[in-house]
Interface confidence: medium
Amino acid sequence: ELCDDDPPEIPHATFKAMAYKEGTMLNCECKRGFRRIKSGSLYMLCTGNSSHSSWDNQCQCTSSATRNTTKQVTPQPEEQKERKTTEMQSPMQPVDQASLPGHCREPPPWENEATERIYHFVVGQMVYYQCVQGYRALHRGPAESVCKMTHGKTRWTQPQLICTGEMETSQFPGEEKPQASPEGRPESETSCLVTTTDFQIQTEMAATMETSIFTTEYQ
């Protein structure tokens, strides 16, 4: 069961998973100037059996300037909806994740991948929060969030983490300081974690031959 919502936003904090539950999807996103190849995959899917889990499919990006004439498989549209994003932090190999049954490790990077990874989480997924550089963590409880199913609806538990503006960085176990500085961010996006939520659509019936798709992005 996919989690309906994004993990909670904590001011001056970002989250990541130490491992990904089977059923998790990772969109094949490409950096600016590149797009997915048609013969490639829409997403990677964490699949497996009781003894081993791995990512099904590989992501491939090609230059937007290069026409791709392969016509057999799914095209790879830019996906900015129903998505959970975590900043790519260089390099991320969470601790002990391979030993977790029913979970996949962080997928290796692919050529020309986007600066943010877009995951579709499933029920039972746990994500861990850390304060961004320049902020210190005041722990008042667990700094993690779990996607739970309650009364037929999914929800994320609220992490008890406050990040204060002191020049000190809280980090994940065994990790170096994050160095990511995602490129191409719209200026309006000021937090270090961008979770793109839903779009609103406004359609107007028009007595002309023109059909319009109007969307408004909001955070």
Partner: antibody, heavy 104, light 107 residues
Framework: PGESLKISCKGS????????IAWVRQMPGKGLEWMGI????????TYSPSFQGQVTISADKSITTTYLQWSSLKASDTAMYYC??????????WGQGTLVTVSS | DIVLTQSPSSLSASVGDRVTITCRAS??????LSWYQQKPGKAPERLIF???GLQRGVPSRFSGSGSGTEFTLTISSLQPEDFATYYC?????????FGQGTKLEIK
């Protein structure tokens, strides 16, 4: 019948060149039919075999508009035509549709 | 082409009923299937993506399940505004294809 026609679909409020746009036909009283798709960034197109050679899908990214065009209309082209934004999870946003009526 | 077969083609139900619509694919489409609701004179609207993901803003009485070749859309407790036509769409393999639709009518 026999006339040419070009209908348009304008996208706004998102990065037009980085999303695929699909065209969908709905004949009177019938279901939805996926016609084809275009990537406005480079005008790469793919058609359903049922529509290949019958219509042309194009785009003008400078005005964030995609087009569906017929060179010679037939009575059987009478239908509602929708454009929709194609994302990994299907068709997330749809235009309100353009009704094309072909009569002699 | 992948053929999607919806069943039933039409269905009469009452407000409060639990309704299930099935979509079968002629070959496996993994979870690349979405569900749409269309009301007369209106454009379709997406309800479910990725076979089971609920579109934001869609009431939680709608749910989707399945993978591979068999998928279901369930409405747990029908409301008056739910009477419409429902379509499934596979977006796994070109050409993408819709099911023929299921018309849900008030009993």
């Amino acid at each position: 019948p026999g006339e040419s026609l070009k209908i348009s679909c304008k996208g706004s409020g998102y990065s037009f060149t980085t999303y695929w746009i699909a065209w969908v036909r709905q004949m009177p009283g019938k279901g939805l039919e996926w016609m084809g798709i275009i990537y406005p960034g480079d005008s790469d197109t793919t058609y359903s075999p049922s529509f290949q050679g019958q219509v042309t899908i194009s785009a003008d990214k400078s005005i964030t508009t995609t087009y569906l065009q017929w060179s010679s209309l037939k009575a059987s082209d009478t239908a509602m035509y929708y454009c929709a934004r194609q994302v990994a999870g299907g068709l997330d946003y749809w235009g309100q549709g353009t009704l094309v009526t072909v009569s002699s | 082409d992948i053929v999607l077969t919806q069943s039933p083609s039409s269905l009469s139900a009452s407000v409060g009923d639990r309704v299930t619509i099935t979509c079968r694919a002629s070959q496996a489409v993994r979870i690349d299937l979405s569900w749409y609701q269309q009301k007369p004179g209106k454009a379709p609207e997406r309800l479910i993506f990725g076979a089971s993901g609920l579109q934001r803003g869609v009431p939680s009485r709608f749910s989707g399940s399945g993978s591979g070749t068999e998928f279901t859309l369930t409405i747990s407790s029908l409301q008056p505004e739910d009477f419409a036509t429902y379509y499934c769409l596979q977006h796994n393999t070109f050409p993408y294809t819709f099911g023929q639709g299921t018309k849900l009518e008030i009993k």
